[in-house]
Amino acid sequence: KLLQVSTIAMQQQEKLIQQERALLNFTEWKRSCALQMKYCQAFMQNSLSSAHNSSPCPNNWIQNRESCYYVSEIWSIWHTSQENCLKEGSTLLQIESKEEMDFITGSLRKIKGSYDYWVGLSQDGHSGRWLWQDGSSPSPGLLPAERSQSANQVCGYVKSNSLLSSNCSTWKYFICEKYALRSSV
């Protein structure tokens, strides 16, 4: 009888050891999965945006230094233009320097000629200050020439080589900007 109990106890202990081993394996597997998921996610986020294309900018976007630009082929009001850019993982163009302004106006001349293009600049209704969409102020040389007498909200646009202002509800082309993908080589 005692031998029988002792045998059962040993079997139970063996089962317990096996279960502990299985649990340990499962925990390791889970941790490894979580780690792989993290790597996979990072890899996906990097590779998805380049989608079989190792160039720093998506197709139909223009590159200059660390930025990619998209010149729209449709008209829209300023707020819809911003929405359209966000859907592309970008924002309306934010011009940081005269060099960037020259590049943009030079590119526009080649692509389309003298049209109006919304950029990410708007005038605060209360203070009258011009601000880029990220909240920063434009450099003094990049303030729109006062052209709008609108009582409505006023936004900035590029035409030829000038930065101008207009009622945000008017229809214009627009330019989106996103960061260029850094080459991993």
């Epitope: 996610q41 996906m44 986020q45 998805l48 945006s49 966000l86 859907k87 592309e88 993982g89 970008s90 924002t91 969409q133 990220d134 909240g135 900007e177 996103k178 960061y179």
Partner: nanobody, 115 residues
Framework: QVQLQESGGGLVQPGGSLRLSCAAS????????MGWYRQAPGKQRELVAA???????AYADSVKGRFTISRDNDENTVALQMNSLKPEDTDVYYC?????????WGQGTQITVSS
């Protein structure tokens, strides 16, 4: 499909602060931008703040300098830190994700700024 779960709304006094958080799940790899919109009764939903997958930010004029949007790509969350709140910030705030040219929305969270 992208699912969004918001948290952090409530009642706050003018001049106070609140932090909204939104967690995304589902097809998170396709998200191009995430952000917050607000909507007052009978009005259109308007952008408050957004952040792209590359980290570019956009804010509504009325919140510039007061609100800050941030994104944690590891946790797939977007947060909106709201400081110096005003009574006119009272609204229902919706988390938004833009993926594959579609808009996905959270259920909305009420923020009331009142003394």
């Amino acid at each position: 499909q992208v699912q969004l779960q918001e948290s952090g709304g409530g009642l706050v006094q003018p001049g106070g602060s609140l932090r909204l958080s939104c967690a995304a799940s589902g097809s998170i790899f396709s998200i191009a931008a995430m952000g917050w919109y607000r909507q007052a009764p009978g009005k259109q939903r308007e952008l408050v703040a957004a952040i792209t997958s590359g980290g570019r930010r956009a804010y509504a004029d009325s919140v510039k300098g007061r609100f800050t949007i941030s994104r944690d790509n590891d946790e797939n969350t977007v947060a909106l830190q709201m400081n110096s709140l005003k009574p006119e910030d009272t609204d229902v705030y919706y988390c938004n994700a833009k993926a594959d040219h579609n808009d996905y929305w959270g259920q909305g969270t009420q923020i009331t700024v009142s003394s």
